[in-house]
């Protein structure tokens, strides 16, 4: 699990690969804070509930992202 | 060198099942996700999905969901590319690209495997 | 998903000419345009990324351009072994595409 215990960061390592969208639980992005100086975005998995911590800066994720979005506005009102 | 080489050509009947593989070499094999594409004879490329090397978890597009799978041996770095039910309009070389995730784009390809659909 | 038209389909030339090759997007894609060469019996093979980006020994006769959904790709001074068919491809979007191709002959 790609996770710290430390009071700075969440994520240790990151991945530059990305998911299928309709396999995410949820996908939170932690914007760069006192704590902690870079954006972080973490994604549980639906199977298992297992969380991965995602590139921010990698095409292929930036590209999730943008697909996750459209799928919330098609399904919102 | 970064290498995928893809096994050989394949000529199945209508019906049965082909396996195609895909072993890479000079990179780390969960390092980058693996794409499909195909080619039917004297057509263009088709992008057919991709598999996250890391987890194992394909995705297909719209035209390859159902009958296609996509798997993953680590142990071997190898992908591979399950096609079922072969019909003739399958007769096509399919190619597995390594992406270049950071920067979206696939840089390097296997040679590809033809797969011969005849009765 | 993002549709790619890319046009002529089919091209004659002469040694030492110009060639262009265009790829118009079904929206905009943010320079996320890349550029195969695909020689027959091989496998594609990358030339740019990025609408411009070169890669690492392709030859500088070959360049790309564009923005917003209109992109180009130009040899400057074909060359025998540029016989080939040309891709454009689309990365913007999880959902890749691909150009019809252009096919490439000697006058």
């Known amino acids: 699990v790609p996770l710290s215990r430390t009071v700075r960061c969440t994520c240790i390592s990151i991945s530059n690969q990305p998911v299928n969208p309709r396999s995410l639980e949820k996908l939170e992005i932690i914007p760069a804070s006192q704590f902690c100086p870079r954006v972080e975005i973490i994604a549980t998995m639906k199977k298992k509930g297992e969380k991965r911590c995602l590139n921010p800066e990698s095409k292929a994720i930036k590209n999730l992202l943008k697909a996750v979005s459209k799928e919330r506005s098609k399904r919102s009102p | 060198e970064v290498q995928l080489v893809q096994s050989g050509a394949e000529v199945k009947k209508p019906g049965a099942t082909v396996k195609i593989s895909c072993k890479v070499s000079?990179?780390?094999?969960?390092?980058?996700?693996m794409h499909w594409v195909r080619q039917a004879p004297g057509k263009g490329l088709k992008w057919m999905g991709w598999?996250?090397?890391?987890?194992?978890?394909?995705t297909y597009a719209d035209d390859f969901k159902g009958r296609f799978t996509f798997t993953l041996d680590t142990s071997t770095s190898t992908a591979y590319m399950e096609l079922s039910s072969l019909r003739s309009e399958d007769t096509a070389v399919y190619y597995c690209a390594r992406n270049y995730d950071y920067d979206g784009y696939f840089d390097v390809w296997g040679q590809g495997t033809t797969v011969t659909v005849s009765s | 998903d993002i549709q790619m038209t890319q046009s002529p389909s089919s091209l004659s030339a002469s040694v030492g000419d110009r060639v262009t090759i265009t790829c118009k997007a079904s929206?905009?894609?943010?320079?996320?345009i890349a550029w195969y060469q695909q020689k027959p019996g091989k496998a594609p093979k990358l030339l740019i990324h990025y609408t411009s980006t070169l890669q690492p020994g392709i030859p500088s006769r070959f360049s790309g351009s564009g923005s917003g959904r209109d992109y180009t790709f130009t040899i400057s001074s074909l060359q025998p072994e540029d016989i080939a068919t040309y891709y454009c491809?689309?990365?913007?979007?999880?959902?890749?595409?691909f150009g019809q191709g252009t096919k490439l002959e000697i006058k």
């Open positions: 598999i996250n090397t890391e987890i194992g978890e394909p």
């Open positions: 000079g990179y780390t094999f969960t390092d980058y996700s």
């Open positions: 491809l689309q990365y913007d979007n999880l959902l890749f595409t």
């Open positions: 929206q905009d894609i943010n320079k996320y």
